[in-house]
């Protein structure tokens, strides 16, 4: 969480942003929010990118102004422009890439006065994991499966009735390279499985961590997986 | 009201060119981008490519040598070039506008020029 | 490129029917795929946008669903007026493309 001042004369308008991380080839949101103003034709908002000349995207006078748009930004960004009059400034970013991490800064002006507010953009591959068991192998195994994860991420098991054990040795990764050549398909093996037990598949890199969990008895399977974002808020 | 009006030649020779201007009305060519497509009875719709607010423009691979877009913002004019027409470019050439800065859909079209290329 | 293929390629139904048209991306496209109208000698129209949006004005007979390769366009009760063609296209990634039309006829 970043909160901005400004000073416009003796006026100064709050700026907030949200650290985020934004997910390779899906959509991303920056959020910025600021001290609304009822006149929408008296709001400026601007985007801009660190290292970057030209803007993210600029909204002035109630419309988008995107002249100065940087090319790699062009088609790819929108303003929640119904909600600019309650403060929300935050933009919408189409199929986001790798390259689009880095230091955003979201500038406002309104009548009431400026501020701006700095954002820390990263961008990965993160998905849930899904274990089945594996009954083709000899002995009872799990395999956890991700589709999608950028950087290479690590992989651990844990187990409820065994707390605290090392399974590296009973287990076995494999990233695959998915075919845009960026993100990879995790594929996890634990063997050697005991019945009535819950065991976790924990997937973590820089931006993400993500949980598979599987209990299994002599009657049913029951699975549940989660996905947390690390640094942001 | 958004309106997107065309104007251009139907029939062209063969190894000639092709203009067509697009005269935009109800929004401004800084805030949106213009796409360019074409409809044929052989290959359906065709997107040609797009001039942004910015200037800048995208053209399809496989018409890049021959596509050329510019525009005058002052005019909400936006002009298209396509060098060396063969019969197989006869088609219908429209002009259209994204539905939002975000390219989803294309919301508004031009009425279309018919482009026929025979000698 | 990215290929989109439209199924049927046409279609014959009686007023009130339920219709449902195909598109399929040879590659996933997330939600960006739009479904446009196309009646004899018109530009096309959008009808849905985002893969679900309905665009301004559109009356609410046709929904859109579907995301990353799978897209459907429903028309809970067909009528008269919506006898033309239909197109998908996908403006997730250049080329954006288009399908090649579903060519819905009314009994």
């Known amino acids: 969480l970043i909160i901005g001042f400004g000073i416009s004369g003796k006026h100064f308008i709050t700026v907030t942003t949200f650290t985020s991380a934004g997910n390779i080839g899906e959509d991303g949101t920056l959020s910025c929010t600021f001290e609304p103003d009822i006149k929408l034709n008296g709001i400026v908002i601007q985007w801009l990118k660190e290292g970057i000349k030209g803007l993210v995207h600029e909204f002035k006078e109630g419309k988008d102004d995107l002249s100065q748009q940087h090319e790699m930004f062009r088609g790819r960004t929108a303003v929640f422009a119904d909600q600019v009059v309650v403060g929300n400034a935050s933009l919408r970013l189409k199929n986001v890439q790798l390259t689009d991490a880095g230091t955003y800064t979201c500038y406002i002006r309104t009548s009431k006065g400026k501020g701006n507010a700095n954002l820390e953009y990263k961008t990965g591959a993160f998905s849930m994991p899904e274990i089945n068991v594996d009954y083709n192998a000899s002995s009872e195994s799990l395999r956890c499966e991700a589709p999608r994860w950028f950087p290479q991420p690590t992989v651990a098991w844990a187990s409820q009735v065994d707390q605290g054990a090392n399974f590296s040795e009973v287990s076995n990764t494999s990233f695959e390279l998915n075919s845009e050549n960026v993100t990879m398909k995790v594929v996890s093996v634990l063997y050697n499985v005991t019945i009535n037990n819950t065991y976790s598949c924990m997937i973590e890199n820089d931006i993400a961590k993500a949980t598979g969990d599987i209990k299994v008895t002599d009657s049913e399977v029951k699975r549940r997986s989660q996905l947390q974002l690390l640094n942001s808020g | 009201q958004i309106q997107l009006q065309q104007s251009g030649p139907g029939l062209v020779q063969p190894s000639q060119s092709l203009s067509i201007t697009c005269t935009v009305s109800?929004?401004?060519?800084?805030?949106?981008?213009v796409q360019w497509i074409r409809q044929s009875p052989g290959k359906g719709l065709e997107w040609l490519g797009v001039i942004w607010s910015s200037g800048s423009t995208d053209y399809n691979a496989a018409f890049l040598s021959r596509l050329s877009f510019s525009k005058d913002n002052s005019k909400s004019q936006v002009f298209f070039q396509m060098n060396s027409l063969q019969a197989d470019d006869s088609a219908i050439y429209y002009c259209?506008?994204?539905?939002?800065?975000?390219?989803?859909?294309?919301?508004?079209w031009g009425q279309g020029t018919l482009v026929t290329v025979s000698a | 490129n990215i290929v989109m293929t439209q199924s049927p390629k046409s279609m014959s139904m009686s007023v009130g029917e339920r219709v449902t048209l195909s598109c399929k991306a040879s590659e996933k496209v997330g939600t960006y795929v739009s479904w446009y109208q196309q009646k004899p000698e018109q530009s096309p129209k959008l009808l849905i946008y985002g893969a679900s949006n309905r665009y301004t004005g559109v009356p609410d007979r046709f929904t859109g669903s579907g995301s990353a390769t799978d897209f459907t366009l429903t028309i809970s009760s067909v009528q008269v007026e919506d006898l033309a063609d239909y197109h998908c296209?996908?403006?997730?990634?250049?080329?954006?493309?288009f399908g090649s039309g579903t060519k819905l006829e009314i009994k």
């Open positions: 109800g929004f401004s060519l800084t805030s949106y981008g």
């Open positions: 296209g996908q403006t997730y990634s250049y080329p954006f493309t």
């Open positions: 259209a506008r994204d539905v939002t800065t975000i390219v989803e859909g294309f919301a508004h």
